[in-house]
Interface confidence: low
Amino acid sequence: EKPVYELQVQKSVTVQEGLCVLVPCSFSYPWRSWYSSPPLYVYWFRDGEIPYYAEVVATNNPDRRVKPETQGRFRLLGDVQKKNCSLSIGDARMEDTGSYFFRVERGRDVKYSYQQNKLNLEVTALIEKPDIHFLEPLESGRPTRLSCSLPGSCEAGPPLTFSWTGNALSPLDPETTRSSELTLTPRPEDHGTNLTCQMKRQGAQVTTERTVQLNVSYAPQTITIFRNGIALEILQNTSYLPVLEGQALRLLCDAPSNPPAHLSWFQGSPALNATPISNTGILELRRVRSAEEGGFTCRAQHPLGFLQIFLNLSVYSLPQLLGPSCSWEAEGLHCRCSFRARPAPSLCWRLEEKPLEGNSSQGSFKVNSSSAGPWANSSLILHGGLSSDLKVSCKAWNIYGSQSGSVLLLQGRSNLGTGVVPAAL
């Protein structure tokens, strides 16, 4: 009967340059148990080679010369006694592209090349990129181990060299960045930066790289409060802001963090479970009232911690003036001026544009001041007769502005005309 030589192997296999591939293979050959038992030798040859003289690409025969260019990279895998001819190809090179055939030899009777079942190997340009593995999320300040590996690569061939680059790595020891593994302690400023692992096969032209963008979780480090786009100055977690009474106020609180912190505003200095007055980073007051003087707190809540800042709001107002109004009384001319301001203003009286300070030593005038609620009152008593038309003025001022009013006393007339003249600083 006809001897049966059969080979099961795929017709073609494609592998990228520098990577590895396992080609499953099984064979059968005629063998009778009553034959003597010489060793079974199998070989993989490059197509076109003459088996008797050629160097093999892989064999289990220790006496056969292996092609130097495939030594250690082409290996028989599996047990040939169990008719397994699987071929492992590592660190594939462009020049490996071509056809290969399998041959079996056992004693003098079994010598056969399976020329009908050639393996076509195609090595293509390396487009596979390495994978960068690490446990996510990266947390600021927490050391994390990163590893770089190339899917489909294996130990065969010259060693792989690695290089890591990225802002997050400086100033590491260069040796550290040449390993396939790396321990990185990310900082907030590393968020969004690139980290690249480049792999190169020593002595080969083959290089490939992958770049990942780092996603670093970090709690807010600072809080900034903006008013009209301008950052307020912060001293010891407190910011001071004077606001004109009645004015609209819009404040923006910002606390850079990843993922973004939840920002909220509270009245005063809140307890941890207090209810916010705003659940965003924006605090809007349509008309600031003096009752709102005191403080607000902006809190940035983050899974990795929280931060808060106190805003000390001082409400100010320009002086408002009522008066002066004058009337004749028993002791002389009695003029009154009422005013209101935050902070409390100063006041002075003028007679014919000349200041009347304190009480007259000659007793010609007397000034009295009192306050009731937000208003303060001052009165001026002028003793003696008035010889001509007189102008009496009162002026109130604080650091934010001033206002003055005057009355013209016309001799011989009972009605006294008044006018208020505002004056801002």
Epitope: S12, T14, E17, G18, D47, M94, T97, G98, S99, N120, L121, E122, T124, A125, L126, I127, Q205, V206, T207, T208
Partner: antibody
Framework: QVQLQQSGAELVKPGASVKLSCKAS????????IHWVKQRSGQGLEWIGW????????KYNEKFKDKATLTADKSSSTVYMELSRLTSEDSAVYFC????????????WGQGTTLTVSS | DVLMTQTPLSLLVSLGDQASISCRSS???????????LEWYLQKPGQSPKLLIY???IRFSGVPDRFSGSGSGTDFTLKISRVEAEDLGVYYC?????????FGGGTKLEIK
């Protein structure tokens, strides 16, 4: 649209070196191989070698292995060919051409760079 | 190296006539993956070459259907069914199966 823009004509002295450039645009630079081809005046075409920007893989025609060096700058999508130890035999037009990975051939060519080696 | 030999060296044809160019390789140019990477290029005077045919018989996009390629193993042919004035130039065959890749010497097509 796909374009391969080559550097201008060069006049160099024997023994010197020259670096020719081929700037690619209009496609993903790393996905196609760039080849270099030589054409001496009034003569045929000779394949010099290829450069695959995707991985930096290079293949030379053995005849040009000690003559040509292929490099690339991914950031500017440019492939370079440096020719060294120039002689009059190197005077020629040098083309760069793009090849699709599926073996479709050189589907786009540069306009060519004329190199004159003369003392 | 695989030597690509083109015949004839030059071809003089009338407009509307058929032209045929032969290309022979010194060895089989069937790649180990089973494909035959045989291509035809046209170089017009003062221009870069242009791809006409790849993998023996596939017309590149935009190439008129009057161009056709055929052949196998070591013998290949380019035919132009009805020559037009714009077809003049030098035609090159090329093999991309075995490194170094090689071009034929070229065939100059001239119009009578």
């Amino acid at each position: 649209q796909v374009q391969l823009q080559q550097s201008g004509a060069e006049l160099v002295k024997p023994g010197a070196s020259v670096k020719l450039s081929c700037k690619a645009s209009g496609y993903t630079f790393t996905e196609y191989t760039i080849h270099w081809v030589k054409q001496r005046s009034g003569q045929g075409l000779e394949w010099i070698g290829w450069f695959y920007p995707g991985s930096g893989s290079i293949k030379y025609n053995e005849k040009f292995k000690d003559k040509a060096t292929l490099t690339a700058d991914k950031s500017s999508s440019t492939v370079y060919m440096e020719l060294s130890r120039l002689t009059s035999e190197d005077s020629a037009v040098y083309f760069c051409a793009r090849q699709e990975e599926g073996g479709i051939g050189f589907d786009y060519w540069g306009q060519g760079t004329t190199l004159t080696v003369s003392s | 190296d695989v030597l690509m030999t083109q015949t004839p060296l030059s071809l003089l044809v009338s407009l509307g006539d058929q032209a045929s160019i032969s290309c022979r390789s010194s060895q089989s140019i069937v790649h180990s993956n089973g494909n035959t990477y045989l291509e035809w290029y046209l170089q017009k005077p003062g221009q870069s070459p242009k791809l006409l045919i790849y993998k023996v018989s596939i017309r590149f996009s935009g190439v008129p259907d009057r161009f056709s390629g055929s052949g196998s193993g070591t013998d290949f042919t380019l035919k132009i069914s009805r020559v037009e004035a714009e077809d003049l130039g030098v035609y090159y065959c090329f093999q991309g199966s075995h490194v170094p890749w090689t071009f034929g010497g070229g065939t100059k097509l001239e119009i009578k």
